[in-house]
């Protein structure tokens, strides 16, 4: 997150981190039920760990943290790397969470977001596009949903109904390491961090997010059948 601010501890209890090795964060994720996460399909890796209930970027133990393995990764069938359409994936964890003030699921929005809606995006991704700077703790950023027209003007030929754009003035954006993390609007999960221009946080090049209202049925059906 570029030019966000430290999230309040436990204010984003659905925020997850996908880790490689002992503690290398490569993507965010969102807890949507006691045993299921959503993330971006492009975050798929054969082996990874899941961390919930953690505030700090560092691996220091926190009392609220819970660690999991992913036992099933189910990318949306319409996703095709390296395209950006249908960029979502369900992850089934090896066990259910212990519900606590630090770890709670978020409800997915059934209605699509409208232009001007204020939302919050969060993550432990880079705080500048030099790709070296990481935050000490989870970052939060208020962003505004942009019109479809403005979104398509920003990225001609690259936007479809499985995406929406959101941003703020130049210098505020999600960035590398935030993928798969939550965009929460009015208390409901509206999107996942997906893509945007490189470097992050450029004028007229907003963040692009997976439009979850288009996938509510697929998410429910997939969880029920697995």
């Amino acid at each position: 997150i570029v030019n966000g601010s430290d999230c309040q501890k436990d204010a984003q209890p659905w925020q997850g981190a996908l880790l490689l090795g002992p503690n290398k964060l490569y993507c965010g994720a969102v807890l949507i039920s006691p045993q299921w996460l959503l993330t971006a399909a492009h975050c798929r890796k054969p082996v990874f760990r899941i961390r919930l209930g953690h505030h700090s970027m560092s691996p220091v133990y926190e009392s609220g943290q819970q660690m999991f393995q992913g036992i099933k990764s189910i990318p949306h069938p319409g996703y095709s790397h390296p395209g950006h359409s249908n960029d979502l994936m369900l992850i089934k964890m090896n066990r259910k969470i212990r519900d606590s003030h630090s770890v709670k699921p978020v409800e997915i929005a059934c209605d699509c977001a409208t232009e001007g809606t204020r939302c919050m995006v969060s993550g432990w991704g880079t705080t500048s596009s030099s790709h070296n700077n990481f935050p000490k703790v989870l970052q939060c950023l208020n962003i505004t949903v942009l019109s479809e027209e403005r979104c398509k003007n920003s990225y001609p030929g690259q936007i479809d109904k499985t995406m929406f754009c959101a941003g703020d003035e130049e210098g505020r954006d999600s960035c590398q390491g935030d993928s798969g993390g939550p965009v929460v609007c009015n208390g409901k999960l509206q999107g996942l961090v997906s893509w945007g221009d490189f470097p992050c946080a450029q004028r007229n090049r907003p963040g692009v997010y997976t439009n979850l209202c288009e996938f509510v049925k697929w998410i429910k059906d997939t969880m029920n059948s697995n």
Partner: antibody
Amino acid sequence: EVQLVESGGGLVQPGGSLRLSCAASGFTFEHYSMNWVRQAPGKGLEWVSYISSSSSYIDYADSVKGRFTISRDNAKNSLYLQMNSLRAEDTAVYYCARDLTDRQSRDYYYYGMDVWGQGTTVTVSS
Amino acid sequence: DIQMTQSPSSVSASVGDRVTITCRASQGISSWLAWYQQKPGKAPKLLIYAASSLQSGVPSRFSGSGSGTDFTLTISSLQPEDFATYYCQQVPIFPYTFGGGTKVEIK
């Protein structure tokens, strides 16, 4: 078959210009960032330039900045390198290479260059 | 710019030998290192990405390890087709930089 084929190399005098081309086939070219990498005779690999999938981000090695220009035409599945003010030290085999890292995606994960052309030779000599 | 230093610059080995090549970055690059193999007159070939992940089609005798600034490429049992020059490359930060190369020669 995924393939990159370079062309446009040749002998040029110092101060002269050349335009290299790289024709891509067998994959969706518009989805991938691309690079030019060169190798002087008997030397190691040197990265020259990078262009993102949509051409929105471009970068160059200091040794070629202001003299070389990278571009692409996604409709033609082609990558280009315009080389001006050529010097003797630009003599090398020039490779185009596909970058597996999608820098538009906002994951923190980096790969490398997975597909390379056969190279085209540029000789700068009087 | 990040400097990549490879050692040794050349190594003589026999078929069946275990060969280890090291690469050091001038600043931390986490696990974001690639290894390439290049044979004379040919283009480089990606062997390993993300320090330890084997590229599709690459034999399992090749392995990579390391994180931060120090990395290693190991060929567990050298085969005749492995005699080549090997390069490391840091991939997260522009400008991309390569190591100077390690030539693996027949003893």
